[in-house]
């Protein structure tokens, strides 16, 4: 199911009508930080460093864009999803 | 799969509060909305308000609000809708619903909790 | 907030026959940044909670018959079931997405004639 979320959440950000998803316009690529300790498991971006980008919507990373996505709530748009609905 | 199971049927007096709970499973509670919707006997369905447990924003609806709170508990993927100051108008069958995703936006319900009956009465 | 209207409030098909619900809402639908109504119908059967049937106005979610369709744009949407059977019989509500507060219609109820 999770899978089909990414999937779905990957096409849009692809599409050619990416309003309503959105990356931030100053992509912060930088150098890549080292795996931690462990399994090596990478933490979502969008839990601290991207945590309050999207406004009325929620924050999504494509790893493949290596940016944040916002899916907005009802009535909302944009970049960050700050714009309502008129 | 996904499911959403809710708390039993409560009976309440009036000027008291009801809390019903929604626990989710099947799917990663945080990606999607949890929305609650009502149905009074023989009526139809009326939007309550919802939360979005990844970023925590709530949204109401006005005709709720003073009277409707509704949580979620990211460590064991439940959600709570708690209506206080019952009147006998609040009697209905309460669902919680997951609010899913598709082109960008949220906003249609696709699975949903068997209800729970709260009755109101003196 | 968006009133959504659906008519007939009562509808009687026989078996094997199109059965075609409408809902019309207060103001548009149509988000300007995908082109695609934010509209969604529901089916409801007695004893049990809402199904999701189409979301946009037209997309059918998984595993729904494809007897059911939905079109329309704008303000005027449509429900149609290309052939009724006898496990269609239930009430059917639309449901905006488009702003807060999110709205329903009040529903239609289909009989078998």
């Known amino acids: 199911d999770l899978q089909e979320a990414d999937l779905d959440l990957l096409r849009v950000t692809l599409s050619s009508k990416p309003q309503a998803l959105a990356t931030p316009n100053k992509e912060e690529h930088g150098k890549r930080k080292k795996k931690g300790k462990g399994l090596g498991k990478k933490r979502d971006p969008c839990l601290r460093k991207y945590k309050d980008f999207c406004i009325h919507g929620e924050c999504k990373y494509v790893k493949e864009l290596r940016a944040p996505s916002c899916i907005c709530h009802p009535g909302y748009h944009g970049e960050r999803c700050h714009g309502l609905s008129l | 799969q996904v499911q959403l199971v809710q708390s039993g049927a409560e009976v309440k007096k009036p000027g008291a509060s009801v809390k019903v709970s929604c626990k989710a499973s099947?799917?990663?509670?945080?990606?999607?909305?949890i929305t609650w919707v009502r149905q009074a006997p023989g009526q139809g369905l009326e939007w309550m308000g919802e939360?979005?447990?990844?970023?925590?924003?709530?949204y109401y609806n006005e005709k709720f609000k003073g009277r409707v709170t509704i949580t979620a508990d990211k460590s064991t993927s439940t959600a709570y809708m708690e209506l206080s100051s019952l009147r006998s108008e609040d009697t209905a069958v309460y669902y919680c619903?997951?609010?899913?995703?598709?082109?960008?936006?949220?906003?249609?319900?696709?699975?949903w909790g068997q209800g729970t009956l709260v009755t109101v009465s003196s | 907030d968006i009133v959504m209207t659906q008519s007939p409030d009562s509808l009687a098909v026989s078996l094997g026959e199109r059965a075609t619900i409408n809902c019309k809402s207060s103001?548009?639908?149509?988000?300007?940044?995908?082109?695609?109504?934010?509209l969604a119908w529901y089916q409801q059967k007695p004893g049990q909670p809402p199904k999701l049937l189409i979301y946009?106005?037209?997309t059918r979610e998984s595993g729904v018959p494809d007897r059911f369709s939905g079109s329309g744009s704008g303000t005027d949407f449509t429900l149609t079931i290309s052939s009724l059977q006898a496990e269609d019989v239930a009430v059917y509500y639309c449901?905006?997405?488009?702003?807060?507060?999110?709205?329903f219609g009040q529903g239609t109820k289909l009989e078998i004639k």
């Open positions: 619903a997951r609010e899913s995703f598709s082109d960008g936006y949220y906003g249609y319900f696709d699975y």
């Open positions: 099947g799917y990663t509670f945080t990606t999607y909305g």
């Open positions: 939360i979005f447990p990844g970023s925590g924003n709530t």
């Open positions: 103001q548009s639908l149509l988000y300007s940044t995908n082109q695609k109504n934010s």
């Open positions: 946009w106005a037209s």
């Open positions: 449901q905006q997405y488009y702003r807060y507060p999110l709205t």
